[in-house]
Interface confidence: low
């Protein structure tokens, strides 16, 4: 028979729990053996004090009885031949030599019937407290402070952990977080990052990625100071932060045992999310302007926002939805996070400026408004935070209320009358088509353009193919030639102030078709851009190249 207990001496800390195992081998008799635990105190090394027994409930010596009844001291059977002695809260007077004795069930006395191990009780000298997060500074106040950090900014917390145990021990320190307003139980404390007793740094499951990316850091500064830095704070980082220090000692058998643990609340941290702060307003109110006049709109980005820079960046843009059109509208212009401006599709050729005029005020200026610029304008601001490295992550966006912009129409009314000079044309001759344009309204300096179009019959009917441009004269007086069905020469010209002519030379049968004239009125703005102020379409003109009697 052999009774085995751990190799001693064991060092444990007052106020903590201890477990001492005992098992018996090589015995005869029933599989379920009984065990008795005794303590020999240093001041009375020959007196065995009965602690607890697996078979006798009255076994406990007076000093242990109340603790056994309260369940603070107990023997727990692991299996028939193994038990563990558990003491919930060690006291200084629990130091001494512990003997595990197994009453004999053997036919003859053989081997050892007890094992002894010394337990030494160390005073509780582990200290944990909040420390100012900077390298130096005054001690943090006793009540945990309430800290507010902006999303994307750095959260730094410090912890002081020290022990003056007279034995060689190692400290492991970890930073944990519990959800705001949630109860703090064992299950709710989530480890953020910890430094093991061998100085290896480990992060809790949700934080491992951020540790690997360098966004989460933990370092030891000096002998007893630990500093955690969470870069790029996120909404989910809000909560109550704790520092837990655990003291470890190496037992004689080579295994490591935790002998003390203390926790301190460091701070209640609120993360001011950008989405809860970002607000966008526009001015100066509903606008009514005339065509060609400048349109100026202001956008103000407000809220308790971090300044643009290392941790945060902003982009601001203007969107326009044409009057009566559904949907979010199209981009007019924007300034990116670097302050570089760009114009949206369809606005590239326009004189449009987007600029920052104050720390959080942005101006959109269209040098010459057009009726097509009428609609509702919104300012869109986006806030970004810098995560790991220099990568920006969009954290929030906000749109202003719609700002209505009205641009007066020019009130230009065009009418066009077209005809074929001479009424009848023959193959080989020149066909002259004339278009007279009448204009009512419009500003001074109105310019006219006119284009000629043809629809060709197929099998005696007009085809479903859209009309083709034959030629025209632009508002700048420049002629533009399209495609003539017969392939011969074409000329287009302005033959009077409101009169345009199309000539088809050397008519062929392919030139047969229905032609029309399409005039348009244009206005030039101060920024030299043009916009169309009106358009019309003449009635149809049929061109049928007859054959001369001699052609047969």
């Amino acid at each position: 028979r052999e009774v085995l207990v751990p190799e001693g001496p064991l060092y444990r800390v007052a106020g903590t729990a201890v477990s001492i195992s005992c098992n018996v081998t090589g015995y005869e008799g029933p599989a379920q053996q009984n065990f008795e635990w005794f303590l020999y105190r240093p001041e009375a090394p020959d007196t065995a004090l009965g602690i607890v027994s697996t078979k006798d409930t009255q076994f406990s010596y007076a000093v242990f009885k109340s603790r056994v009844v309260a369940g603070e001291v107990q023997v727990q059977r692991l299996q028939g031949d193994a038990v563990v002695l558990k003491i919930a809260r060690l006291q200084a007077q629990d130091a001494g030599i512990y003997e595990c004795h197994t009453p004999s069930t053997d036919t003859r006395y053989l081997g050892s019937y007890s094992g002894k191990v010394e337990l030494r009780v160390l005073p509780d000298v582990l200290q944990v407290s909040a420390a100012p997060p900077g390298p130096r500074g005054r001690q943090a106040p006793t009540s945990p402070p309430r800290m507010t950090v902006h999303e994307g900014q750095e959260l730094a917390l410090g912890c002081l952990a020290r022990t003056s145990t007279q034995k060689h021990t190692h400290l492991a320190v970890s930073f944990g977080r519990s959800v705001p307003e949630a109860p703090v139980g064992r299950s709710t404390l989530q480890e953020v990052v910890g430094i093991r007793s061998d100085l290896a740094v480990e992060a809790g499951a949700p934080y491992a990625e951020r540790l690997a990316a360098g966004e989460l850091r933990l370092g030891k500064e000096g002998t007893d100071r630990y500093r955690m830095v969470v870069g790029g704070a996120q909404a989910g980082d809000a909560g109550t932060y704790h520092c837990t220090a655990a003291e470890w000692i190496q037992d004689p058998d080579g295994s490591w045992a935790q002998i003390a643990e203390k926790r301190a609340v460091l701070a209640h941290v609120d993360v001011q999310t950008l989405s809860s702060q970002l607000a966008v307003t526009v001015g100066p109110g509903e606008r009514r302007i005339g065509p060609g006049e400048p349109l100026e709109l202001l956008c103000n980005v407000s809220g308790a926002l971090p300044p643009a820079g290392r941790h945060a960046a902003y982009s601001v843009g203007w969107e326009m939805a044409p009057a009566g059109a559904p949907g979010p509208g199209r981009l007019v212009a924007q300034l990116d996070t670097e302050g570089v401006g760009s114009l949206g599709p369809g606005y590239e050729g326009r004189h449009i400026a987007m600029e920052k005029v104050a720390s959080r005020t942005y101006r959109l200026r269209l040098e010459a408004a057009r009726p097509g610029d009428a609609g509702t304008y919104r300012c869109l601001a986006k806030a970004y935070v810098r995560g790991s490295g220099t990568r920006l992550r969009e954290a929030a966006s906000a749109r202003s209320r719609p700002l209505p912009v009205h641009v007066r129409e020019e009130g230009v009314v065009l009418e066009a009358v077209a005809w074929l000079a001479g009424g009848t044309v023959y193959r080989g001759e020149t066909a002259s088509l004339l278009c007279n344009i009448s204009v009512r309204g419009g500003p001074p300096g109105l310019r006219l353009a006119a284009s000629w179009w043809v629809e060709r019959p197929e099998d005696g009917e007009l085809s479903s193919v859209p009309a083709q441009l034959v030629g025209g004269v632009g508002q700048d007086g420049v002629a533009e030639l399209g495609v003539r069905p017969g392939g011969g020469p074409v000329s287009v010209e302005l033959v009077g102030p409101r009169s345009h002519r199309l000539r088809l030379h050397s008519l062929g049968p392919e030139d047969e078709g229905v032609y029309h004239c399409a005039p348009s009125a244009w206005v030039q703005h101060a920024d030299y851009s043009w916009y169309q102020a009106g358009s019309a379409r003449s009635g149809p003109v049929t061109v049928y190249p007859y054959m001369h009697a001699l052609d047969t």
Partner: antibody, heavy 123, light 108 residues
Amino acid sequence: AVTLDESGGGLQTPGGGLSLVCKASGFSISSYEMQWVRQAPGKGLEWVAGIDDDGSSRAYAPAVKGRATISRDNGQSTVRLQLNNLRAEDTGTYYCAKTIYAATLNAGEIDAWGHGTEVIVSS
Amino acid sequence: ALTQPSSVSANPGETVKITCSGGGSWYGSYYYGWYQQKSPGSAPVTLIYNNDKRPSDIPSRFSGSESGSTATLTITGVQAEDEAVYFCGGYDSTTTDMFGAGTTLTVL
């Protein structure tokens, strides 16, 4: 089988107090967070209070904060809700609920409910 | 606040989906439960907890899922006895809105 039996309901007077008790059986209560949920007549479920496995942390809904105390006796397998300064809007059926964790404060983790005890607050 | 539709209806044998959104994030994850109540004042029955866990005594036609912070309760092959009010439960850091307002399922 897991069973939760609530008691202590009945007719109460406004301004008075009541004590509801939930007796658990079929599982070891000491490993789980317990919650109280109530339902006013014709209304939906409303979370009232929660207490974690070892009773070290409690949380309350804003509607009862300052008037309610949740406690537990793991040895007796009971959870108690004390509600003072009763109001008419406290009327309803009170359910005791067991969660699957020790301390999560989450109404998405309830795996067992009691049958409820009816409370009527009226003068 | 947890948001769910006030009512849904289906013919027997059809598949019904009820959604719930607006729960708070618990360490970056979202956990919802689904509870059935056949009549007001009767005890709720847990159909699904932790997004997709189904108690052993609940029929397999009830299933749960969660994606992008929205939970979905799916009843495949709905039966007449499934007519009830379905509540979703979740996490809310303010403890104000831990349950949705309930969805009434009508089996036509």
